[in-house]
Amino acid sequence: KSSNEATNITPKHNMKAFLDELKAENIKKFLYNFTQIPHLAGTEQNFQLAKQIQSQWKEFGLDSVELAHYDVLLSYPNKTHPNYISIINEDGNEIFNTSLFEPPPPGYENVSDIVPPFSAFSPQGMPEGDLVYVNYARTEDFFKLERDMKINCSGKIVIARYGKVFRGNKVKNAQLAGAKGVILYSDPADYFAPGVKSYPDGWNLPGGGVQRGNILNLNGAGDPLTPGYPANEYAYRRGIAEAVGLPSIPVHPIGYYDAQKLLEKMGGSAPPDSSWRGSLKVPYNVGPGFTGNFSTQKVKMHIHSTNEVTRIYNVIGTLRGAVEPDRYVILGGHRDSWVFGGIDPQSGAAVVHEIVRSFGTLKKEGWRPRRTILFASWDAEEFGLLGSTEWAEENSRLLQERGVAYINADSSIEGNYTLRVDCTPLMYSLVHNLTKELKSPDEGFEGKSLYESWTKKSPSPEFSGMPRISKLGSGNDFEVFFQRLGIASGRARYTKNWETNKFSGYPLYHSVYETYELVEKFYDPMFKYHLTVAQVRGGMVFELANSIVLPFDCRDYAVVLRKYADKIYSISMKHPQEMKTYSVSFDSLFSAVKNFTEIASKFSERLQDFDKSNPIVLRMMNDQLMFLERAFIDPLGLPDRPFYRHVIYAPSSHNKYAGESFPGIYDALFDIESKVDPSKAWGEVKRQIYVAAFTVQAAAETLSEVA
């Protein structure tokens, strides 16, 4: 299975030696080291950590470790003019102000440079007006408000609860609805799990805790001022008015203590149904404005943050391949954090550090991987995936020719229940085979495989006896590699029980309370889940870099393509009359999928039989596998989203975190019944079916015999 070329270690021993070298105690030690002070992108502290990681990766034995810097647009609160929200009376007096920062966690009272909660890239402004509660501010929430309840958000300040979708989508939706400001808050219904204490006594969010985060709608652009190109020393930068993805209205996040004060006075319409009610002791009235006694009071936002071009630093480590040095397997995760980064990102960075150490140990013993492994510590992920995107833009020509796979390594944990994997279908079999070889860390599964506990706790909705593997969306550093460049990508982490925990993400996400102690006391005291994630991520990298034949199975792509075609067809068939009227047919797509299935099957047969000792044929077959993901890239990109170029997958237009299949067709069909020009709308559906069918057929042909 694994190559023993250019090494004196036997193939079986290779992977085992690598995995055996990974130690939970080291991950714990690294996590502690990375979380003692804040490492906000663009700060001196994060630059110093970059240099520390560079130095340590060199010590671990990598061939080279370089810093790659870029000057990108970041956003910071004004140190002397803090952001806050007020309730003002008819005389304009502030009768209530939201907190300026979070109460410090115990042990961190004297830490300086904790950035106060803010919505990164919010414009400055001091809008005042009536409040409208918009639930999660999803597309469907605004449909409910505007279409069913006839509530107009124009000129209003909206208050939305965090959760369900990426915060940038909430802000975009609010802007489109005409709002003049957005208040984001964490409702206990989403960020306080029943039966668990709040920090520092458990992993729940205290009332003073606030989620930071960027509110951009970049759609894969990277640095807002240099879309498509690296933000280097000679970059041409757009003016701020032409910057990509910046919000146009002030936005600010608050905790649930402060939200209570705003929401308890709400009047106007009652919530449309129970799904609009959170867990605060307030009526969840939609508004607009406050109830009777308080109807003359208004809400005022005070936002003074500034956007600044700031230098960021990626750390790029190289372990040169012995046989195919021009084939790159990349393991990358970010280093920058909002505050201490106890989970996001340092639980991931600590795992990457230990993976590098283990690979370095093998290298010092005379081993090399077959292919080159690149390790990356990305900067400014929290500000819009900027470090990874700028580096990929700078190196796009190399990556599109040489990139075999990208494995993402942000937070290793978001819970401690079971494994969660999102990846390209090409990696399904790799993940299945690897997890069958790893021990489960779960209680009650002693002596059982990770595959077994994962399958039991998170079964596939389609295939019995198999675990759920999800589509890649976005909101993390794999985006540019997968959605723009078409490099096979995957991610793995330990997650919560989604059935019993309905809150969004983990409660302390992006708050000051995401500390080392949070992980060490409440999530993973033995660091056994971190170790398992290190084994999964590291094991995937090992196999991708070292197996003679790339561990990709193109037949799994065929299976999902059929599933996605069926799904999009079903959506379209909700409009049978229009499909008939406008002669909409999916025949070309189903035909292409059928062709892909047959060609993939034949390719797989050839893959079993070919002469692996012939380096030219081996390279040819591997190139067909490597370039299959690339074949799903449309150079023109998706409509209005030029950097989302993958025809099979894109981040949902309604939630950046979620993946959508056949996104071009999906978006063309979305809310089609409300389009003013149905002929044009259904024409776009037909065009998108054509693009998808062509792309699937073209991809299939890359797997055909070359001559």
Epitope: S99, L100, P103
Partner: antibody
């Protein structure tokens, strides 16, 4: 009715030790952070130490943390303060107090017990 | 550590008068502030928490206000039982410190 009753204080020698206890009733003891607050005669209040719900986390006034140990026994509804190497400046009335959480006010107070450190 | 400065240290007032006690925090504590009343020879009793919320059973003549660094406790129409000492205390961070106290005496 909520009650917090501290054990007898008394006169102790400088350099010696003393263990105070506080017995709670009328509320669910394990649902509360507990603390010791002291008051030098005719002076203000000074927080000494706190302990979380299950005793897994303790917090101290920096100047006292090497000498004082707070603990609790939820089965017995008891709070303790072990005071070592006592000094004359530790002379005070010691109050047992209960709060709702880490970031919370002291909702319940005991009647206090006077500890006098003197030769 | 956050220091709490209370003023005045003492004041005399008559039954029926209104008095205001102020408390200043050395750092921003939002509304993480409590007020206590202590009568001679007794333990402190909670009056106000979260800067302005009256504790159960506290008469409405007491009111708390303020946010950030400046806070006040107002007693309208003093009653004989209101005389004693008053303390503010923050619970924003460890250590939770008290103000030096205000002794309210009958004029």
């Amino acid at each position: 009715e909520v009650k917090l009753v501290e054990s007898e204080g008394g006169l102790v020698q400088p350099g010696s030790s003393k263990k105070l206890s506080c017995t709670a009733s009328g509320f669910t003891f394990s649902d509360y952070y507990m603390a010791w607050v002291r008051q030098v005669p005719e002076k203000g209040l000074e927080w000494v130490a706190s302990i979380n719900y299950d005793g897994s986390s303790t917090y101290y006034l920096d100047s006292l943390k090497s000498r004082f140990i707070i603990s609790r026994d939820n089965a017995k509804n008891n709070l303790y303060l072990q005071m070592n190497s006592l000094k004359s400046e530790d002379t005070a009335t010691y109050y047992c107090a209960g709060s709702d959480g880490y970031w919370a006010w002291f909702a319940y107070w005991g009647q206090g017990t006077l500890v006098t450190v003197s030769a | 550590d956050i220091q709490m400065t209370q003023s005045p240290a003492s004041l005399s007032a008559s039954v029926g008068e209104a008095v205001t006690i102020t408390c200043r925090a050395s750092g921003n504590i939002h509304n993480y502030l409590a007020w206590y009343q202590q009568k001679q020879g007794k333990s402190p009793q909670l009056l106000v928490y979260n800067a302005e919320t009256l504790a159960d059973g506290v008469p409405s003549r007491f009111s708390g206000s303020g946010s950030g660094t400046q806070f006040s406790l107002k007693i309208n129409s003093l009653r004989p039982e209101d005389f004693g000492s008053y303390y503010c205390q923050h619970f924003w961070s460890t250590p939770p410190t008290f103000g030096g106290g205000t002794k309210l005496e009958i004029k």
